[in-house]
């Protein structure tokens, strides 16, 4: 069952899930002058068995010029640092992760994605809440959500997470420093 | 050239039903998500439904969960929007709206639509 909403925002935090859990999909998005192949689904799902969880589908993105072509371009210099260092990112997130069963991991990133990345969770998932790079957390209890399902109808839990400037004052003295930056995490989590 | 063009709107009253029909043509693209949106005078553009062509996903608003039905017609490039149980919050201007790919709902969803109606009126009375 699909969450109906999108996790709850908090303002100037981010959040992320360590693992998706099947039935979980992602949308196939490009990034500007590309786009999905003509045959391409709009969706990745994650699927699997008792044993073992993967994405079903593969995102290909070709360029919106080309005609009935599947030619990928290659990125820019810049472009490729870029996606270098999101793809360490990646590595390093995965590295960390225990693997869950009935679960995904984040699916690696294609040629010409966008920035932004569209999940539709399912019932049961968490996601898990950092304040961006300036902020502080200030905790009152898990900087977490989860989907869950109430009388028939999805929501998502209200994660315990306040994030101050590090210029202002703490409301919660003696609150740890938060322990890691969220640069690694996709755009398309963040809170505004 | 993309067309969207909404019809079926106009006055109900409270409690009332409506449907709302639209008919794209042009759309360059296989696999796409039409959606609805809605602006009341003075508020912001406000999602309503969407879903994609395979009926895959199908997402809807807070505001209209368990009133409103987002569905496809017999034609593949044709979507209705079923109003139930009207309100006179329901009031607004409602447009319809297409993406290249998945469906993409919430708050901050209509700027990833690329194709919008010109938008048709659903007035609630009490």
């Known amino acids: 069952e699909l969450c109906d909403d999108d996790p709850p925002k908090i303002t100037h935090a981010t959040f992320k899930a360590v693992a998706y859990k099947e039935g979980t999909m992602l949308n196939c998005e490009c990034k500007r002058g590309f786009r999905r192949i003509k045959s391409g689904s709009p969706y990745m799902l994650c699927t699997g068995n008792s044993s073992h969880s993967s994405w079903d589908n593969q995102c290909q993105c070709t360029s919106s010029a080309a005609r009935n072509t599947t030619k990928q371009v290659t990125p820019q210099p810049e472009e490729q640092k870029e996606r270098k260092t999101t793809e360490m990112q990646s590595q390093m997130q995965l590295a960390d992760q225990v693997s869950l069963p009935g679960h995904c991991r984040e699916p690696p990133p294609w040629e010409n994605e966008a920035t932004e990345r569209i999940y539709h969770f399912v019932v049961g998932q968490t996601v898990y809440y950092q304040c961006v790079q300036g902020y502080r957390a200030l905790h009152r209890g898990p900087a977490e959500s989860v989907c869950k399902m109430t009388h028939g109808k999805t929501r998502w839990t209200q994660p315990q997470l306040i994030c101050t400037g590090e210029t202002e004052p703490s409301q919660f003295p003696g609150e740890e420093e938060p322990q890691a930056s969220p640069d690694g995490l996709p755009e398309s989590e963040t809170s505004r | 050239q993309v067309q969207l063009v909404e019809s079926g709107g106009g006055l109900v009253q409270a409690g009332g039903s409506l449907r709302l029909s639209c008919a794209a043509s042009?759309?360059?693209?296989?696999?796409?998500?039409m959606g609805w949106f809605r602006q009341a005078p003075g508020k912001e553009r406000e999602f309503v439904a969407a879903r994609d062509l395979e009926g895959i996903i199908t997402r809807y608003g807070d505001s209209v969960k368990g009133r409103f039905t987002i569905s496809r017609g017999n034609a593949k490039n044709t979507v209705f929007l079923q109003m139930n149980s009207l309100k006179p919050e329901d009031t607004a201007v409602y447009y319809c709206?297409?993406?290249?790919?998945?469906?993409?709902?919430?708050?901050?969803?209509?700027?990833?639509?690329?194709?919008w109606g010109q938008g048709t009126q659903v007035t609630v009375s009490s």
């Open positions: 709206a297409a993406r290249d790919g998945g469906v993409v709902a919430g708050s901050r969803s209509s700027a990833q639509y690329n194709y």
């Open positions: 042009g759309i360059p693209f296989d696999n796409y998500a």
